[in-house]
Amino acid sequence: MMTGTIETTGNISAEKGGSIILQCHLSSTTAQVTQVNWEQQDQLLAICNADLGWHISPSFKDRVAPGPGLGLTLQSLTVNDTGEYFCIYHTYPDGTYTGRIFLEVLESSVAEHGARFQIP
C-alpha cells in the first residue's frame, strides 16, 4: 500500500535570465528511494539514481545543475521554460510517486516564489 505523499514547491515564478530550484520531498513512507526522474512536460531533464548518481540530459547540460539534494536547479531561464515540471520518485517497495510543479518565467522583476521551499 502506498502511504507516501509528495510535497513540492507548487506554482512558482522566476525572472527571465535568472535561476530557480525545483524541489520535491517524499514523506509519510519508509520506502527506499531508488531513483528520482525530473521531466519537463515530455522531456527527460535529469535522473538521480541512488547508486549511479546524477545523469543530466545532454541537451540540458548547460542550463541544468543537479541538486540541492534530489532537487534540480534551472539556470539562464527563458520564457520557453514556462510550463509543468514533474519529479518522479521510484521507490521500493511502494512504487512510483509523482509531484508536479508549475513554473512561470516572467519578463519583469515581479516574480514571486511559492510558499514552500522558498529561495532566498
Epitope: 527506499q32 531508488t34 531513483q35 521531466e39 515530455d42 522531456q43 527527460l44 535522473i47 539514481n49 541512488a50 547508486d51 549511479l52 545523469h55 540530459s57 541537451s59 521510484h90 521500493y92 517497495p93
Partner: antibody, heavy 118, light 107 residues
Framework: EVQLLESGGGLVQPGGSLRLSCAAS????????MSWVRQAPGKGLEWVAA????????YYADSVKGRFTISRDNSKNTLYLQMNSLRAEDTAVYYC???????????WGQGTLVTVSS | DIQMTQSPSSLSASVGDRVTITCRAS??????LNWYQQKPGKAPKLLIY???SLQSGVPSRFSGSGSGTDFTLTISSLQPEDFATYYC?????????FGGGTKVEIK
C-alpha cells in the same frame, strides 16, 4: 572496458530446463539494473526480464512469467536466467544487457543460442 | 502493454542519402524512447537514448527527435556501414517493448 559474456545456451527438449549466465566485468555490477532480451531466428527483439541493481526486484514479460526466473549474484558479478517448462517458441538468441537509470540498454553481450526442439 | 509501431519495415537507399525512420507509441511515453542498430549475427548497439541524446561514440550523422507518441531517427548522410536493421524501444513502463524493426538496404 565494459564486457558482458553470456553462456549456458544449447539444445533442450520441450518441457526441459536451462540456466543462462551472464558474466559482467569493467563496471560496478551491483549498481546497475540488468535485462535479458531475446531474438527468435529472423525475428525482432523481445524483452524477457529485468532485475534492479539496488533492490533485486524483478520484472517479466507475460510470455515467460511463471516459467523464467531472473536473478543475480553481485559477489560474482553474474546475472542468471533460469528457464523452466521450455517451449518451441522460446527458441532464440538470448542477450543480457546493462540498463543504466532503467532507461536505456547501453551494453549488450554477444548472445547465446537456445534451441527448444525434440 | 505499450505497442511500438515502426515504419517503414524496410527501405532501400544509397550512400549519401538522408534517411528517416519513424516510431509511434500506443500511448504517451514522454521521451523514454531509445534507438538501436543491429547488424546480422551481432548484438544490438545503442545509438540514441531518451529520444534525442546521442550515445557516446556514435557518429553525429545519427539524430533522434520527438516526444509523447511520435519519434524519428534520422541518418543525415547514409554511410556504407549504416546498412543494418534499426529498432526503437520504449522504457516508460514494463514490459519494455521494441518496434518491429526497419531494415535499411542498399539501393
Amino acid at each position: 572496458e565494459v564486457q558482458l559474456l553470456e553462456s549456458g545456451g544449447g539444445l533442450v527438449q520441450p518441457g526441459g530446463s536451462l540456466r543462462l549466465s551472464c558474466a559482467a566485468s569493467g563496471f560496478t555490477f551491483s549498481s546497475y539494473s540488468m535485462s535479458w532480451v531475446r531474438q527468435a531466428p529472423g525475428k525482432g527483439l523481445e524483452w524477457v526480464a529485468a532485475i534492479k541493481g539496488s533492490t533485486s526486484s524483478s520484472y517479466y514479460a507475460d510470455s515467460v512469467k511463471g516459467r523464467f526466473t531472473i536473478s543475480r549474484d553481485n559477489s560474482k558479478n553474474t546475472l542468471y536466467l533460469q528457464m523452466n517448462s521450455l517451449r518451441a517458441e522460446d527458441t532464440a538468441v538470448y542477450y543480457c544487457a546493462r540498463e543504466p537509470y532503467d532507461v536505456w540498454l547501453d551494453y549488450w553481450g554477444q548472445g547465446t543460442l537456445v534451441t527448444v526442439s525434440s | 502493454d505499450i505497442q511500438m509501431t515502426q515504419s517503414p519495415s524496410s527501405l532501400s537507399a544509397s550512400v549519401g542519402d538522408r534517411v528517416t525512420i519513424t516510431c509511434r507509441a500506443s500511448q504517451s511515453i514522454s521521451s523514454y524512447l531509445n534507438w538501436y542498430q543491429q547488424k546480422p549475427g551481432k548484438a544490438p548497439k545503442l545509438l540514441i537514448y531518451a529520444a534525442s541524446s546521442l550515445q557516446s561514440g556514435v557518429p553525429s550523422r545519427f539524430s533522434g527527435s520527438g516526444s509523447g507518441t511520435d519519434f524519428t531517427l534520422t541518418i543525415s548522410s547514409l554511410q556504407p556501414e549504416d546498412f543494418a536493421t534499426y529498432y526503437c524501444q520504449q522504457s516508460y513502463s514494463t514490459p519494455l517493448t521494441f518496434g518491429g524493426g526497419t531494415k535499411v538496404e542498399i539501393k
